[in-house]
C-alpha cells in the first residue's frame, strides 16, 4: 500500500455569486487527519492520532496552505461561466502518493455539483474529461482560466505535486505513528444461515498500517476467491483500519475450518467457536 | 490532419551532438499534449526519451538525463532533441509522437552514430 | 521506474485463432494511463488501444484491452493476416514512461 495524502476542498456559489469560505478535509493513508474550522479559520487535527502525527508542532502551516488552496478555489468558480439560479459547488481532490519502490503519483480532480468533469496526473500534465458534453465545456473553461492563471502568477501544478510530497514526506519523517505496527484483534463468529449450513465471519480490527491478508482456509487450504465474501478495509477512526471476511460452510464441519490472517511480517490461524 | 515529421542529419560522430527537429501541422504544440521523442535501436524495444508539454514543462528519462535537451519554437510549431556525448549505443530510428497514449507519430529518421 | 514485462515474447498463431498477450507491471498504474501499440517492419507503432480499453481510431473491433492495478492483456479475438506484427504496452503513470520489451505475434 502506497502512502497518500488527500484533499478534499469544496466552495459554493448562490446564484452566481461566490460564497466566502470553503469547506476542507485532508486524509493521510485514507484516515481523516484534518479539517478547516471555519469558525476559527484554523486547520484542525482529527482526533488524537492526527495531534500524534506532528507531536507538538503547531498546524500554522497547514492552516496556511488550506486557506491559499481554498482562495484559488474560490477564484476558479468565478470563472465558470454556466452558473445558473441556485447553489453549486466546485469541489478539488488532490492526492500524492509514496509507492514503495519510492515512485510517485499525484492527481487531481475537479467536480461541479458532485460530477466529475476534469482530472490531471500532475507529475506528467496530462488531463483527462468524461465524454460529456457539461463535462467538456466545463472542463474548457477551468483549464483555460488556469492556464491564464499560471501564465500571470508564475506558479504552476508541478509546484502543487511537489509540496503535498514533501508534506507527506514531513509527516513520515517526524511520525512515529505512521511508522508503527499495531496487529489486529481477531475475532471469529457464526451465525445460522439456511439448513444445514452456517456462516462463519472473520473479523479483524485496530491494526495498522492498512495491508492484511484475511482468508478462510479448510483443511489447511485457502478456499477460493468467490467462495468468500470481503469487507472494505476500512478506517476505524483511531488512526486504525478494520475488516471482515465471511465464508457459509456445512454445519458439524466447522473444526475444519480456520480463519488465517497475515500483517507486518505476523501471522496467526483462528478456529470456528463451537 | 495532425502531422509530425522528424529532420536533421542520419550521420552522427561519437563524442558530438545528435540534432533532431521535428515540425507539426494540424495541431498547436502549445495547445495541449506532451510532445514526445522515442527511440527505438536496430532490433530492439521502443525507449521514452523525455517530452516538452504544451505549456512548455520538459520531462526526461533519468537514464539520459545528463545528456538531454528538449526544446520548443512555438513560432514555427516545433519540437527539438538534442542529445549529447553520443556513442554508438545512440544508433536507433528515433520517432517523434505526440500525447501520453501517443496517437501520432512521425515516420522516424534513422540516426547513425559513427566516425 | 515502473517495468512492464510482456509475455509471452513470441506467440506463434495461425489465422482464426484468439491471442492473448499480457503485460505485468512492477508497481500499480493507473488504468487510464495505460496503452498498446502495434509495429510492423519499417512502419512507426500506431496507437491499437488507448485508456486500458478504449480502442484507437480505425482499428478493428476484433481487437480488445482489459485489466487494472499490475496486470494487463490485450486479446484479438479472430487473428486476421494483417495482425501479424509486435505489440508493446506501455504506461503513463509516472515519469519515466516505459514500454514493455514487445510480444512478437508470428503466423504459426
Known amino acids: 500500500e502506497p502512502h497518500s495524502l488527500r484533499y478534499n476542498l469544496t466552495v459554493l456559489s448562490w446564484d452566481g455569486s461566490v460564497q466566502s469560505g470553503f469547506l476542507a478535509e485532508v486524509h493521510l493513508d485514507g484516515q481523516p487527519f484534518l479539517r478547516y474550522d471555519r469558525q476559527k479559520c484554523r486547520a484542525k487535527p482529527q482526533g488524537q492520532w492526527a495531534e500524534d502525527v506532528l507531536g507538538n508542532k503547531t498546524w500554522d502551516r497547514e492552516t496556511r496552505d488550506l486557506t491559499g488552496n481554498g482562495k484559488d478555489l474560490r477564484m476558479t468558480l468565478a470563472h465558470i461561466k454556466d452558473q445558473k439560479e441556485g447553489l453549486h459547488s466546485l469541489q478539488e481532490i488532490r492526492v500524492c502518493e509514496i509507492h514503495e519502490d519510492n515512485s510517485t503519483r499525484s492527481s487531481q480532480h475537479f467536480y461541479y455539483d458532485g460530477e466529475l468533469f476534469l482530472s490531471q496526473n500532475v507529475e506528467t500534465e496530462e488531463w483527462t474529461v468524461p465524454q460529456s458534453s457539461r463535462a467538456q465545456t466545463l472542463a474548457m473553461n477551468v483549464r483555460n482560466f488556469l492556464k491564464e492563471d499560471a501564465m500571470k502568477t508564475k506558479t504552476h501544478y508541478h509546484a502543487m505535486h511537489a509540496d503535498c510530497l514533501q508534506e507527506l514526506r514531513r509527516y513520515l519523517e517526524s511520525s512515529v505513528v505512521l511508522r508503527r505496527r499495531v496487529p489486529p484483534m481477531v475475532n471469529v463468529t457464526r451465525s445460522e444461515a439456511s439448513e444445514g449450513n452456517i456462516t462463519v465471519t472473520c473479523r479483524a480490527s485496530s491494526f495498522y498500517p492498512r495491508n492484511i491478508t484475511l482468508t478462510w482456509r479448510q483443511d489447511g487450504v485457502s478456499l477460493s476467491h468467490d467462495t468468500q465474501q470481503w469487507g472494505d478495509v476500512l478506517p476505524d477512526g483511531n488512526g486504525t483500519y478494520q475488516t471482515w471476511v465471511a465464508t457459509r460452510i456445512c454445519q458439524g464441519e466447522e473444526q475444519r475450518f480456520t480463519c488465517y490472517m497475515e500483517h507486518s511480517g505476523n501471522h496467526s490461524t483462528h478456529p470456528v467457536p463451537s | 490532419q495532425v502531422q509530425l515529421q522528424e529532420s536533421g542529419p542520419g550521420l552522427v560522430k561519437p563524442s558530438e551532438t545528435l540534432s533532431l527537429t521535428c515540425t507539426v501541422s494540424?495541431?498547436?504544440?502549445?495547445?495541449?499534449?506532451?510532445w514526445n521523442w522515442i527511440r527505438q535501436p536496430p532490433g530492439k524495444g521502443l525507449e521514452w526519451m523525455g517530452f516538452v508539454s504544451y505549456s512548455g514543462t520538459t520531462k526526461y528519462n533519468p537514464s539520459l538525463k545528463s545528456r538531454i535537451t528538449i526544446s520548443r519554437d512555438t513560432s514555427e510549431n516545433q519540437f527539438s532533441l538534442k542529445l549529447s556525448s553520443v556513442t554508438a549505443a545512440d544508433t536507433a530510428v528515433y520517432y517523434c509522437a505526440r500525447g501520453y497514449g501517443f496517437d501520432y507519430w512521425g515516420q522516424g529518421t534513422t540516426v547513425t552514430v559513427s566516425s | 521506474e515502473i517495468v512492464l514485462t510482456q509475455s509471452p515474447a513470441t506467440l506463434s498463431l495461425s489465422p482464426g485463432e484468439r491471442a492473448t498477450l499480457s503485460c505485468s507491471a512492477t508497481s500499480s498504474i493507473s488504468s487510464i494511463y495505460f496503452h498498446w501499440y502495434q509495429q510492423k517492419p519499417g512502419q512507426a507503432p500506431r496507437l491499437l488501444i488507448y485508456r486500458t480499453s478504449n480502442l484507437a481510431s480505425g482499428i478493428p473491433a476484433r481487437f480488445s484491452g482489459s485489466g487494472s492495478g499490475t496486470s494487463y492483456t490485450l486479446t484479438i479475438s479472430s487473428l486476421e493476416p494483417e495482425d501479424f506484427a509486435v505489440y508493446y504496452c506501455?504506461?503513463?503513470?509516472?515519469?519515466?514512461?516505459?514500454f514493455g520489451q514487445g510480444t512478437k505475434l508470428e503466423i504459426k
Open positions: 494540424g495541431y498547436s504544440i502549445t495547445s495541449d499534449y506532451a
Open positions: 506501455q504506461q503513463g503513470t509516472t515519469i519515466p514512461f516505459t
